[in-house]
């Protein structure tokens, strides 16, 4: 089973972006981490992005004020991936 | 200024296939979900499909699932959608529209008649 | 599935408002907070006026506002002009497909 985020949080949050941050997993086997913004009530995410497994800290810029944001983050391994931890912030 | 141009389209026989393209410029294609919406003529809008900025989220209308297939390639700029077992019913106008909270951007048009 | 329904005409004189209903049938696994609507004349392709049920792209008149209530969906456009006479659809998530639902479209006319 691929482990999975446990203390994903907000910082820094303004109108455009959210900032997010967590305690990188201490795994070999871990690729990295799969960010997806998707706009509550919508179907896909409207943003996308992957980062390191030493990074712990990423600022989802270009959001639009006022909506609620479902913001998941998914960590990589080579052939698998965890289920999403995910939060709820409006801009 | 942002931009998408639908090529492609035409005249094909039932049965037959075509590959449309989105030409995206003026923004980060990458960055966003891309959609194929279709318009008979004289009638309303129809969704046909989705695919998400790295493509790794992808859905169909039911109406097309099995014979239409969505892509796309980040590092042209375009968005593609091959359409295979076309029927009479097919034949629409096609658009490509971003995905932002709503189809903020959609482009022209390109016309598919399937016809014997 | 979702369905969205809309009349099929509207019509109003210049300076009048009118709204624009759009009723969400059927579970929708809450893809109905984000009903955007758009604009289509005849020939053009169509162009978004309001998205997440009320809000505003930069360069969309004020004269077009969006609500929601219960089920219904609604676009008013106040101050009728001539240019207003187009198509309006209504649109949405089903998020059990999942998939992007239209409504049937509205034709509005503006009199005179």
């Known amino acids: 089973e691929v482990p999975q985020l446990t203390d994903l949080s907000f910082v820094d949050i303004t109108d455009s972006s959210i900032g997010l941050r967590w305690t990188p997993l201490n795994s070999s086997t871990i690729i990295g981490y799969r960010i997806t913004v998707v706009a509550a009530g919508e179907g896909i995410p409207i943003f996308e992005d992957f980062v390191d497994s030493s990074v712990g800290y990423y600022t989802v810029t270009g959001l639009e004020p006022g909506i609620d944001y479902d913001i998941s983050v998914i960590t990589l391994i080579n052939g698998g991936e965890s289920a999403p931890t995910t939060l709820t912030q409006q801009t | 200024q942002v931009q998408l141009v639908e090529s492609g389209g035409g005249l094909v026989q039932p049965g037959g296939s075509l590959r449309l393209s989105c030409a995206a410029s003026?923004?980060?294609?990458?960055?966003?979900?891309m959609h194929w919406v279709r318009q008979a003529p004289g009638k309303g809008l129809e969704w046909v499909s989705v695919?998400?900025?790295?493509?790794?989220?992808?859905y169909y209308a039911d109406s097309v699932k099995g014979r239409f297939t969505i892509s796309r390639d980040n590092s042209k700029n375009t968005l593609y959608l091959q359409m295979n077992s076309l029927r009479a019913e097919d034949t629409a106008v096609y658009y490509c529209?971003?995905?932002?909270?709503?189809?903020?951007?959609w482009g022209q048009g390109t016309l598919v008649t399937v016809s014997s | 599935d979702i369905a969205l329904t809309q009349p099929a005409s509207v019509s109003g004189s210049p300076g009048q408002s009118i709204t624009i209903s759009c009723t969400g049938t059927?579970?929708?696994?809450?893809?109905?907070?984000?009903v955007s609507w758009y604009q289509q004349h005849p020939g053009k392709a169509p162009k978004l006026m309001i998205y997440?049920?009320?809000k505003r792209p930069s360069g969309v008149s004020n004269r077009f506002s969006g609500s929601k209530s219960g089920n219904t969906a609604s676009l008013t456009i106040s101050g009728l002009q001539a240019e207003d006479e187009a198509d309006y659809y209504c649109?949405?998530?089903?998020?059990?497909?999942?998939?992007?639902?239209f409504g049937g479209g509205t034709k509005l006319t503006v009199l005179g």
């Open positions: 529209a971003r995905n932002k909270v709503g189809f903020d951007v």
């Open positions: 003026g923004f980060t294609f990458s960055s966003y979900g």
């Open positions: 695919i998400s900025s790295s493509g790794s989220y992808i």
């Open positions: 059927s579970s929708d696994g809450g893809g109905y907070n984000t």
């Open positions: 997440y049920v009320h």
């Open positions: 649109q949405s998530w089903d998020l059990l497909a999942p998939s992007v639902v």
